[in-house]
Amino acid sequence: NFMYSKTVKRLSKLQEYQQYYPSLTCVMEGKDMEDWSCCPTPWTSFQSSCYFISTVMQSWTKSQNNCSVMGADLVVINTKEEQDFITQNLKINSAYFLGLSDPKGWRHWQWVDQTPYNKNVTFWHSGEPNSPDERCAIINFRSEEWGWNDVHCHVPQKSICKMKKIYI
């Protein structure tokens, strides 16, 4: 009876999410494997988040709006492990917007989700950021490694969206 009611709850939750995400990919987790964590298909998952790589070339503001429509934000990178996971799926000759910007050009960088900007957990390429006119951050492959660079916000780039996993 308990299992039945849990399944009914799950199905109703799935139906609720289906209006936003036509397809979800879910895995069982938790100590009793009773919880399902889901990401929209074809998003990838890492820890408690889902990631989507957009190959559409758009400005930073349009890229953030695009993520927002999908219930996400441009990616906020919190650890080196997270960055290493993300970069596995990126093309080395491309650049991708991050959810990091400096709208006033005062070198006050801010994450889109209001996560405090911690200088100790940043992965700027050597010599970056280097221009107060370049107020948005990308991740790209340079000098044999992935890192961040400041660029003009209005220049179209690919982008990465991130959202919390859906638990049902």
């Epitope: 758009q58 400005s59 930073w60 503001t61 349009k62 953030q64 709006n65 910007s101 709208p103 006033k104 050009g105 280097n130 221009s131 107060p132 006119d133 370049e134 107020r135 948005c136 660029v151 003009h152 916000c153 209005h154 220049v155 179209p156």
Partner: antibody
């Protein structure tokens, strides 16, 4: 006082080339992105090319891509526009304009007086 | 590309009256309260001159008779009261995304 002075315009035959120059003074040229904007006779404004302050980024509309090249020499406080394979529709007054960044975009806060390019056989 | 449509194409205004020019963008040029729409004045034989930046900010040295408003896709330049030397073409321009684009212009004539 900020000054932008264009030169190099003139009459050229279709298929020909011209190099426009813009001499900047009164500000730290190397700190600003710069653009060329043109205006055909009796028409509106059309952006033609942009170059970032550090020369790392150039951008063109499809109408001139592959034919026009924007460049700068920060040591000489000068902006250039090399125009090749010129067409009749490139006939216009060409303005050099300084970009001032604001939030996620920019605007053109100073403009030169313009130089006239006429493409005709 | 973002298309900017200005209206009217021309208008004639008497000195002391109000002139209103609108600029409609094919998509939003706003982001979190910042509106990346700018206005320029161009008199015959002269280069454009910046009047208003970011929808409503008056450029230094521009008379307070000029004002701008709007957000997202709809923006307005107002001249009130109009003076004789305001006869010119007026252009809007967006910069939220490359390529930067201009409106087709509005010619203001003084009656």
């Amino acid at each position: 006082e900020v000054q932008l002075v264009e030169s190099g315009g003139g009459l050229v035959k279709p298929g020909g080339s011209l190099r426009l120059s813009c001499a900047a003074s009164g500000f730290t040229f190397s700190s600003y992105g710069m653009s060329w904007v043109r205006q055909a006779p009796g028409k509106g404004l059309e952006w033609v090319a942009t170059i970032s302050s550090g020369d790392s980024y150039t951008y063109y509309p499809d109408s001139v891509k592959g034919r026009f090249t924007i460049s700068r020499d920060n040591a000489k406080n000068s902006l250039y526009l090399q125009m090749n394979s010129l067409r009749a529709e490139d006939t216009a007054v060409y303005y050099c304009a300084r970009q001032l960044y604001y939030s996620y975009g920019y605007y053109f806060d100073y403009w030169g007086q313009g130089t006239t390019v006429t493409v005709s056989s | 590309d973002i298309v900017l449509t200005q209206s009217p194409a021309s208008l004639a205004v008497s000195p002391g009256q109000r002139a209103t020019i609108t600029c409609r963008a094919s998509e939003s040029v706003s982001f979190h309260g910042t509106h990346l729409m700018h206005w320029y004045q161009q008199k015959p034989g002269q280069p454009p001159k910046l009047l208003i930046y970011a929808a409503s900010n008056l450029e230094s040295g521009v008379p307070a008779r000029f004002s701008g408003s709007g957000s997202e896709t709809d923006f307005t330049l107002t001249i009130n009261p109009v003076e004789a030397n305001d006869a010119a073409n007026y252009y809007c321009q967006q910069s939220i995304e490359d390529p930067p684009t201009f409106g087709g212009g509005t010619k203001v004539e003084i009656k």
